[in-house]
């Protein structure tokens, strides 16, 4: 009975999400393997988040709006481990918008989800950021490593979206 009611709840939750995400990829987790954590297909998952790499070239604002329509934001990177996971799926000759911007050009960087900007947990390439006119951040491969660079927000780039996992 308990299992039956849990399955019914899951199915109704899945139906609820199906109007937003036609397909979900779920894995069982939790100490009794009773919880399912899901990401939209074909998003990838790491820890408690889902990630989507958009190869559509768009401005930073349009990229953020695009993520938002999918229930996500441009990616907020909190740890080196998270960045290392993300970069496994990136092309080394491309650049991707992050959810990091400095709209006034005052070098007051801010994350799209209001996570406090911590200078100690940043991965800027050497010499970056370097221009008050370049108010949006990308991640790209330079000098044999992945890092961040400030760029013009209006210049179209690829992007990375991030959302919380869906638990059912």
């Amino acid at each position: 009975n308990f299992m039956y009611s849990k399955t019914v709840k899951r199915l109704s939750k899945l139906q609820e999400y199906q109007q937003y995400y036609p397909s979900l990829t779920c894995v069982m987790e939790g100490k009794d393997m009773e919880d399912w954590s899901c990401c939209p297909t074909p998003w990838t998952s790491f820890q408690s988040s889902c990630y989507f790499i958009s190869t559509v070239m768009q401005s930073w604002t349009k990229s953020q709006n695009n993520c938002s329509v999918m229930g996500a934001d441009l990616v907020v990177i909190n740890t080196k481990e998270e960045q290392d996971f993300i970069t496994q799926n990136l092309k080394i000759n491309s650049a991707y918008f992050l959810g990091l911007s400095d709209p006034k050009g005052w070098r007051h960087w801010q994350w799209v989800d209001q996570t406090p900007y911590n200078k100690n947990v940043t991965f800027w390439h050497s010499g970056e950021p370097n221009s008050p006119d370049e108010r949006c951040a990308i991640i790209n491969f330079r000098s044999e490593e992945w890092g961040w660079n400030d760029v013009h927000c209006h210049v179209p780039q690829k992007s990375i979206c991030k959302m919380k996992k869906i638990y059912i």
């Epitope: 768009q58 401005s59 604002t61 108010r135 013009h152 209006h154 210049v155």
Partner: antibody, heavy 121, light 111 residues
Framework: EVQLVESGGGLVKPGGSLRLSCAAS????????MSWVRQAPGKGLEWVAT????????YYPDSVKGRFTISRDNAKNSLYLQMNSLRAEDTAVYYC??????????????WGQGTTVTVSS | DIVLTQSPASLAVSPGQRATITCRAS??????????MHWYQQKPGQPPKLLIY???NLESGVPARFSGSGSETDFTLTINPVEAEDTANYYC?????????FGGGTKVEIK
């Protein structure tokens, strides 16, 4: 006082080349992105090329891509537009304009008086 | 590319009256309260001159009879009251995304 003075325009045959210059004064040229904007006779404004302050970024519309090259010499406070394989439809007044960034975009806050390019056989 | 459509293409206004020009973008040029639409005036034989930036901000030295409003895709430039010296072409321009694009222009004549 901010001043932008274009030169180098003239009459050229189709397929020919021309190099436009824009001399900037009255501001720290190296700190600003710059653009070329053109206006065909009796027509509206059409953006032609952009270069970032540090020369790291250039951008062109499809109509001139591969034919026009924007460049700058910050030591000389000068902006250039090299125009090759010119066509009749490139006939226009060419303005150089300074970009001022605002939030996620920019606007053109100062314009030169323009230089006229005529492409005709 | 973002297409900007200005209307009307031309208008004639009597001195002291109000002139209203609209600019419609093919997609939003706004983001979180910032509207990246700008307005320029071009008098015959002269280069364009910045009037309004970011939809509603009056450029320094521009008379207060010029004002701008709007958001997302619909923007308006208003001249009130119109003076004889306002005879010119007026252009809108967006900068939220490359390439920067201009509207086709509106010719304002004073009756």
């Amino acid at each position: 006082e901010v001043q932008l003075v274009e030169s180098g325009g003239g009459l050229v045959k189709p397929g020919g080349s021309l190099r436009l210059s824009c001399a900037a004064s009255g501001f720290t040229f190296s700190s600003y992105g710059m653009s070329w904007v053109r206006q065909a006779p009796g027509k509206g404004l059409e953006w032609v090329a952009t270069i970032s302050s540090g020369d790291s970024y250039t951008y062109y519309p499809d109509s001139v891509k591969g034919r026009f090259t924007i460049s700058r010499d910050n030591a000389k406070n000068s902006l250039y537009l090299q125009m090759n394989s010119l066509r009749a439809e490139d006939t226009a007044v060419y303005y150089c304009a300074r970009q001022l960034y605002y939030s996620y975009g920019y606007y053109f806050d100062y314009w030169g008086q323009g230089t006229t390019v005529t492409v005709s056989s | 590319d973002i297409v900007l459509t200005q209307s009307p293409a031309s208008l004639a206004v009597s001195p002291g009256q109000r002139a209203t020009i609209t600019c419609r973008a093919s997609e939003s040029v706004s983001f979180h309260g910032t509207h990246l639409m700008h307005w320029y005036q071009q008098k015959p034989g002269q280069p364009p001159k910045l009037l309004i930036y970011a939809a509603s901000n009056l450029e320094s030295g521009v008379p207060a009879r010029f004002s701008g409003s709007g958001s997302e895709t619909d923007f308006t430039l208003t001249i009130n009251p119109v003076e004889a010296e306002d005879t010119a072409n007026y252009y809108c321009q967006q900068s939220i995304e490359d390439p920067p694009t201009f509207g086709g222009g509106t010719k304002v004549e004073i009756k």
